[in-house]
Every structure is written in C-alpha cells, then in structure tokens.
Amino acid sequence: MACLGFQRHKAQLNLATRTWPCTLLFFLLFIPVFCKAMHVAQPAVVLASSRGIASFVCEYASPGKATEVRVTVLRQADSQVTEVCAATYMMGNELTFLDDSICTGTSSGNQVNLTIQGLRAMDTGLYICKVELMYPPPYYLGIGNGTQIYVIDPEPCPDSDFLLWILAAVSSGLFFYSFLLTAVSLSKMLKKRSPLTTGVYVKMPPTEPECEKQFQPYFIPIN
C-alpha cells in the first residue's frame, strides 16, 4: 500500500487536470518526502493445519536500502502482548531463528515467509509481524495489522498399540471377507458356465477383403 501522503497527492493530481505539468512536477519532487514511513502487509486470517502449523507471508515496503533486517512475531490476545519469535538476517541470506524457536522462515527480497509450529487451540490469537531495518542507519520500524491465526485441536488419538490392533483386525476381516466373496463369485460363475463347456471354435473367413488380419471367432454349441 502506498503511504497516505502519496494517496493524498494522487487525489490532488486528479483534480488539477488543467495544470497537470506543474502538478506532476510537484508530485514527482515530493513523493520521496511524503513516503518515508515503512508499511508492513500480512494476511488478515490464517487457519492452522491439523498438525498445528500456520504459515503466512509478511511483506514490507522498504524506504531505505537495508542490509540487516530484524523480524519479530508478536502474539496479541486479551490485550496481552508476547514475543513468539525473532530473527535478524542479512539481506540475501537465510532467515535463522534460534534452535528452540517454534518459528521457521525464508526471506526473498522484501518478503518473509513465516511458519509457526506446535500450535494448539489455546494459541489462537492475533499474530503481528514487526519489521525493523537495523542497518545501515537510519532505523525504520514497521508493524503489520496482524494475522488472526485460528487453531483447532484435532480429536485426541487413542493409544497407538490399541490402534494397531484395531487396524490389524479390520484389515484381516476385510481380507477374509474379500477372499470369501471371491470364492463364492467364482463358484457361481463356474456353475453358470457348466452347460457351455462343450463347444468348438471355428475360424470363419473375413467379411471384407481388406480386413484379412482380423479373425472373428464364432461359437458353435455341440449338443
């Protein structure tokens, strides 16, 4: 999103149609002055996966050429703010969080792809992306509006051994059922086919001369 000053001057530019060359010059000269604030964009809502993983993109419009960027994820719930994770990275390098961090991420230009793991229903809340351009000076701060992450806990899993027994019993049952079904079907088929077993196949001449390679068998029952 362009900064507010930019939008205001854009509106003025639309009004000043007759004096557009002057206005355009003014507009071009003053864009750098009015667009110094750093804006951070992030999705409004994200639903965590059943495994408690949520991913979202945090994008910032950089007003300067930063070489060192700090990204912090904050969680806001019930007016309480806590730091989820933070990482400082050099532009062009990989984003590295601490080993014990629940966050992982990758950076690409002015975009940071963040993934938060190990989330549970109680972790539902507003996750705010804070970007700071640390080096070289001047320092710039950008705070996103936040991504509401919804986490739904999966149904509690029964004991794994018990689950294996159930799985084994079900698969065995299905195997025997399919085996039985196959046997019954085969026996029925054989019974139906029994009066047709005595017969001979006779090779007939082709109906059309060009189809010499095609043979049409004709079944003649023998009483």
Epitope: G5, C35, K36, M38, Y140, L141
Partner: antibody, heavy 120, light 108 residues
Framework: QVQLVESGGGVVQPGRSLRLSCAAS????????MHWVRQAPGKGLEWVAV????????YYADSVKGRFTISRDNSKSTLYLQMNSLRAEDTAVYYC?????????????WGQGTLVTVSS | EIVLTQSPGTLSLSPGERATLSCRAS???????LAWYQQKPGQAPRLLIY???SRATGIPDRFSGSGSGTDFTLTISRLEPEDFAVYYC?????????FGPGTKVDIK
C-alpha cells in the same frame, strides 16, 4: 516497580568529557531498548540516542553523532552515555528512558534526570 | 529527519473545557509510530498515547489520540486541574526519533 536513576551530571568545561549512568530496576533490563533524551533549560525535549536490547544497534541524533556514545551493561542493568567534546549547547537535563516493549520506541518510563552544565 | 510541528504554542482554557492539540509531520508517519507525552514543571515526561491512539497504562480515558499520515491530534475531553502542563508529540517510525516543540496548556 520500574525505576530509572541517572547519575554523573555536573559542571564541565567546553571540550571536556563526562560519563552519565542510569541504574535500572524493577524490570528485565536486557529485554528493552534504552534511550537518552535531553532538555535544555526552558526548552523542549530532544531525543539523543537509543541502544538495542543486546547493545548491537545504536542510533544517534545528528547533533551528537561522533561525540556521544551510548552503551549498556546488561549484567549490571546499567545504561551509559559517554559525552566527549562537550559544547555549551549540550547543557541540559539528561533523562534516561525505557522503550515501550514490542510496539516501537515510545518511552514508557523515565528517570528524574541529571543536569549537565557545560560552561567555562 | 522528520520534523514535527505543534500548534498552538499555548492553549489557554478553563477546567472542564475540551482541549485539542495538533501535531504535524514534515513526512508521512505511520499512525503506529506516533506518541504523546505530558510534562509538568520540574518533572520527567509521562507517556500518554502511543501508536497515535492507544492509551498508555494508567492514563484516564479523557485523553484520546487520533490522526494518520502527517496530521495527528491529542484531545482532552474535559480538562482537570492536573492536566495543565506541556504536551509533546514524538515520532518513532524512523531514526532520529524526533519530538515536537510542545504545546503549553495553561489556565485561562
């Protein structure tokens, strides 16, 4: 409760040096950015410098750049301001303040200040 | 650097009246990064508003902040005797973190 106590102020001659200290208590010092803000007698507030949590990043006002150095000792919960090549215009009450955690550097707690007078 | 201008320089009002203080920036300041402070004689400043409109801990709801871009406002809905002081705005979106020159609210 949060407390910030400045010390080290006094009268000093132009061109000389002075070191200010700020002892912090009542909060986890190493989690916060810390600032120095000054106020000349009868004048408004002027931001001087900031130092990040770990001391790696420091930023200064143009008027003090190259003369003042901000530093911190997290083990002692103390903030410092080393002032070199002092000028008459550096005469002010120097406040140590804490950056509001998370949402940028608005200053939520301030010390009572220490007066620095640069005079010959 | 971002230069902040405050108006009026002095505001003379009576207790119970509404005070409207203005802060204008030379460049666009995201609304997330503007703060207001109150300072009484012989005291350190006190944070009132951060993020242009969020009240700091313990600040009464008669204080409210608004604005975006380059124009910001601090409103005191009903002046109490303890509200007569100097008010400063500050931007912290980019370094150097500048303050405005202040607006003095005194008793008429």
């Amino acid at each position: 409760q949060v407390q910030l106590v400045e010390s080290g102020g006094g009268v000093v001659q132009p061109g000389r040096s002075l070191r200010l200290s700020c002892a912090a208590s009542g909060f986890t010092f190493s989690n916060y950015c810390m600032h120095w803000v000054r106020q000349a007698p009868g004048k408004g507030l002027e931001w001087v410098a900031v130092i990040w949590y770990d001391g790696r990043n420091k930023y200064y006002a143009d008027s003090v750049k190259g003369r003042f150095t901000i530093s911190r000792d997290n083990s002692k919960s103390t903030l410092y301001l080393q002032m070199n090549s002092l000028r008459a215009e550096d005469t002010a009450v120097y406040y140590c303040s804490r950056g509001l955690l998370w949402f940028g550097e608005s200053l939520d707690y301030w010390g009572q200040g220490t007066l620095v007078t640069v005079s010959s | 650097e971002i230069v902040l201008t405050q108006s009026p320089g002095t505001l003379s009002l009576s207790p119970g009246e509404r005070a409207t203080l203005s802060c204008r920036a030379s460049q666009s300041v995201s609304s997330s990064y503007l703060a207001w402070y109150q300072q009484k004689p012989g005291q350190a400043p006190r944070l009132l508003i951060y993020g242009a409109s969020s009240r700091a801990t313990g600040i009464p709801d008669r204080f409210s902040g608004s604005g975006s871009g380059t124009d910001f406002t601090l409103t005191i809905s009903r002046l109490e005797p303890e509200d007569f002081a100097v008010y400063y705005c500050q931007q912290y979106g980019s370094s150097p973190f500048t303050f405005g020159p202040g607006t003095k609210v005194d008793i008429k």
